[in-house]
Interface confidence: medium
């Protein structure tokens, strides 16, 4: 169950899905990927204030302990809850191959 | 597959399992948990430098883009890769109940 999607820090400041455009050169893939030439990378970015999109019990504990010991325990972190698959056309010794990567593009985000 | 467990920042500085002792009061559980009275909370704390314990392709992408756009893209974050279960004995309206929580204590850490 998703704990509160209302961001107390203001619109767009809390953990959510962002899209960052990246070239193969940006990603360091130019020597082994043929296509796509550019990737719309979806990733999870933003703050994780108390109970916002808490992934599980561990995230709730982390929030409580961060409040008590901010120098020791970091706040929960915005990370992918699930992924969208993506097909890369790769160079091989003999030609090309298609490979599906299941853990490349974030689909949904939560705090943990 | 675990990407490099050698921490370039110095011993103990990178993403790893830490134990933080917490009372029921610390966790805000005093009104609904009977036992344990104190929890040895295992959690993932530490930096995620390039390729250190990279969880997946997404983490590798994040590292690359963070290097290029540090103000836009955060570095990967140290989070649980797996959990240890824990039994909480809880107060109920009529008495007590036992509940296993599978997502309470971090068992292993990675960067994502």
């Amino acid at each position: 169950a998703r704990n509160g999607d209302h961001c107390p820090l203001g619109p767009g400041r809390c953990c959510r899905l962002h899209t960052v455009r990246a070239s193969l050169e940006d990603l360091g893939w130019a020597d082994w990927v043929l296509s796509p030439r550019e990737v719309q990378v979806t990733m999870c970015i933003g703050a994780c204030p108390s109970q916002f999109r808490a992934a599980n019990m561990h995230a709730q504990i982390k929030t409580s302990l961060h409040r008590l010991k901010p120098d020791t325990v970091p706040a929960p972190c915005c990370v992918p809850a699930s992924y969208n698959p993506m097909v890369l056309i790769q160079k091989t010794d003999t030609g090309v191959s298609l490979q599906t990567y299941d853990d490349l593009l974030a689909k949904d985000c939560h705090c943990i | 597959a675990r990407n490099g467990d050698h921490c370039p920042l110095g011993p103990g500085r990178c993403c790893r399992l830490h134990t933080v002792r917490a009372s029921l009061e610390d966790l805000g559980w005093a009104d609904w948990v009977l036992s344990p009275r104190e929890v040895q909370v295992t959690m993932c704390i530490g930096a995620c430098p390039s390729q250190f314990r990279a969880a997946n392709m997404h983490a590798q992408i994040k590292t690359s883009l963070h290097r290029l756009k540090p103000d836009t893209v955060p570095a990967p974050c140290c989070v649980p890769a797996s959990y240890n279960p824990m039994v909480l004995i809880q107060k109920t309206d009529t008495g007590v109940s036992l509940q296993t929580y599978d997502d309470l204590l971090a068992k292993d850490c990675h960067c994502i």
């Epitope: - | 009977l34 009275r37 039994v87």
Partner: antibody, heavy 116, light 110 residues
Amino acid sequence: EVQLLESGGGLVQPGGSLRLSCAASGFTFSDYAMSWVRQAPGKGLEWVSVISHDGSSKYYADSVKGRFTISRDNSKNTLYLQMNSLRAEDTAVYYCARGPINFDYWGQGTLVTVSS
Amino acid sequence: QSVLTQPPSASGTPGQRVTISCSGSSSNIGSNYVTWYQQLPGTAPKLLIYDSSQRPSGVPDRFSGSKSGTSASLAISGLRSEDEADYYCGTWDSSLSGYVFGGGTKLTVL
């Protein structure tokens, strides 16, 4: 008055099975977690198993894990302990007790003897 | 070998005060309440102290419990002959996900 009455004990050969029952009365059985505790002749108490009030959670001592099964029928106010693959070291008086951590009421116990 | 450690025996004369110790670790006594049980010869155990120091109704105030760190103790003041019994400490162990007892202490009233 709270009462717990165990039954089903007896003599059984090694490798055999027994099913113990504990009939509860004098309280709302479905509100309480219930436990089994055993005591070998001349020895101390050993916790065996606990089951939550609704039967959804069950925990066992390592010494009986995989061989014993705790269950309950709240409509009959009865707690059970199915014991399979019995060993000589399972010989003991078996008590049912109310609660998971503070055993505030105990039955009189039923003796299980595992011997050839 | 019990997870909780108790002395196997203790003794005292009528009117005396005796203390029974119970030692454990951070995963049991260190992080949980302790319960004490009294078992009179030939009978089922009886709850004596719960939540480390609380007495159920009907238990005389001669019996008291305390806990410090990973140890607990049961004190019996004004010892009586009817106190002659076996005494067990017990608590939940968070690492084992199960309940653990001490080996028991046989109290003799001299």
